[in-house]
């Protein structure tokens, strides 16, 4: 039975040209995290494998940095980066947990962080 929950940074906004940290945290489970995938819609951004380390997808290699922790740092943001991001936790023995973050990249200098929320 899957007892864990994923806490994410929720709905966030950032300025064009700036950077943002995407963070997820898995709690309420003793399952072992074997791999975390970061995806934007159906596109793979990065993989953090517990044994093998990080892989950054080539199309994002110049503006995605691994970390902090299992998170992901997006740099040189453009308006096209606006959209849904998913952290997909592969765990043993529980299985897969998915968290969702919505990022809005703003033209103006007004960029506020949204509230945190949980996805069971």
């Amino acid at each position: 039975m899957m007892t864990g929950t994923i806490e994410t940074t929720g709905n966030i906004s950032a300025e064009k040209g700036g950077s943002i940290i995407l963070q997820c945290h898995l709690s309420s489970t003793t399952a072992q995290v074997t791999q975390v995938n970061w995806e934007q819609q159906d596109q793979l951004l990065a993989i953090c494998n517990a044994d093998l380390g990080w892989h950054i997808s080539p199309s994002f290699k110049d503006r995605v940095a691994p970390g902090p922790g299992l998170g992901l740092t997006l740099q040189s943001l453009t308006v096209n980066d606006t959209g849904e991001y998913f952290c997909i936790y592969h765990t043993y023995p529980d299985g897969t947990y998915t968290g969702r973050i919505f990022l809005e990249v703003l033209e103006s200098s007004v960029a506020e962080h949204g509230a945190r929320f949980q996805i069971p």
Epitope: I47, S59, K61
Partner: antibody, heavy 121, light 106 residues
């Protein structure tokens, strides 16, 4: 030590089928994205296709010349990669190598010796 | 279909620097990899993810990838570096090899 050993090659008639195997050892096979690459006699390297890890969907991608004829699969419980080749053509004659896709700094390794597939009537 | 272009041959004197280029549309948006193959042997990965060297590959091998061109550079080329070199464009959906370059150490 990372090791890949290909097998299953041989002589087959045009239109025939063959299944190649690749036994992997020395690394966590289930996390690896694996590709098949071939080399025709005296020619260059040609990518055949790949299969991603189950944790990345286990999906497959193929080069245009083999799409619809070749199928890549994996058995993570046996640390084995497969290539099923149907409707073989003379131009499929080559040494076939299985390889680890270079995703991770901690998982790059040598190629195997390959297995020769000869398609001839 | 995506294509990579390499010069068929490159010659270099021992101790000099050899540069082998690989060109393809927006190659810089993919990862560039390089393989060395000597006659009768299986290929060896010498550069991956544009500029990283696998363990056991000498420091004289280096790589770069930007725009439409990836480059393999061998500093202080040795006789043992004479081989065929293949570039590879790698991304999450497909892989393509170049036609290969024969490096001759004069």
């Amino acid at each position: 030590e990372v090791q890949l050993v290909e097998s299953g090659g041989g002589l087959v008639k045009p239109g025939g089928s063959l299944r190649l195997s690749c036994a992997a050892s020395g690394f966590t096979f289930s996390y690896a994205w694996m590709s098949w690459v071939r080399q025709a006699p005296g020619k260059g390297l040609e990518w055949v296709g790949r299969i991603k890890s189950k944790t990345n969907g286990g999906t497959t991608d193929y080069a245009a010349p083999v799409k619809g004829r070749f199928t890549i699969s994996r058995d993570d419980s046996k640390d084995t990669l497969y290539l099923l080749m149907n409707s073989l053509k003379t131009e499929d004659t080559a040494v076939y190598y299985c390889t680890i896709d270079p995703l991770y700094d901690l998982l790059t390794g040598p190629w195997g010796q390959g297995t020769l597939v000869t398609v001839s009537s | 279909s995506y294509e990579l272009t390499q010069p068929p041959s490159v010659s270099v004197s021992p101790g000099q620097t050899a540069s082998i280029t690989c060109s393809g549309d927006k190659l810089g948006d993919k990862y560039g990899c390089w393989y060395q193959q000597k006659p009768g042997q299986s290929p060896i990965l010498v550069i991956y993810q544009d500029s990283k060297r696998p363990s056991g590959i000498p420091e004289r091998f280096s790589g770069s990838n930007s725009g439409n061109t990836a480059t393999l550079t061998i500093s202080g080329t040795q006789a043992m570096d004479e081989a065929d070199y293949y570039c590879q464009a790698w991304d999450s959906s497909t892989v393509v090899f170049g036609g290969g370059t024969k490096l001759t150490v004069l």
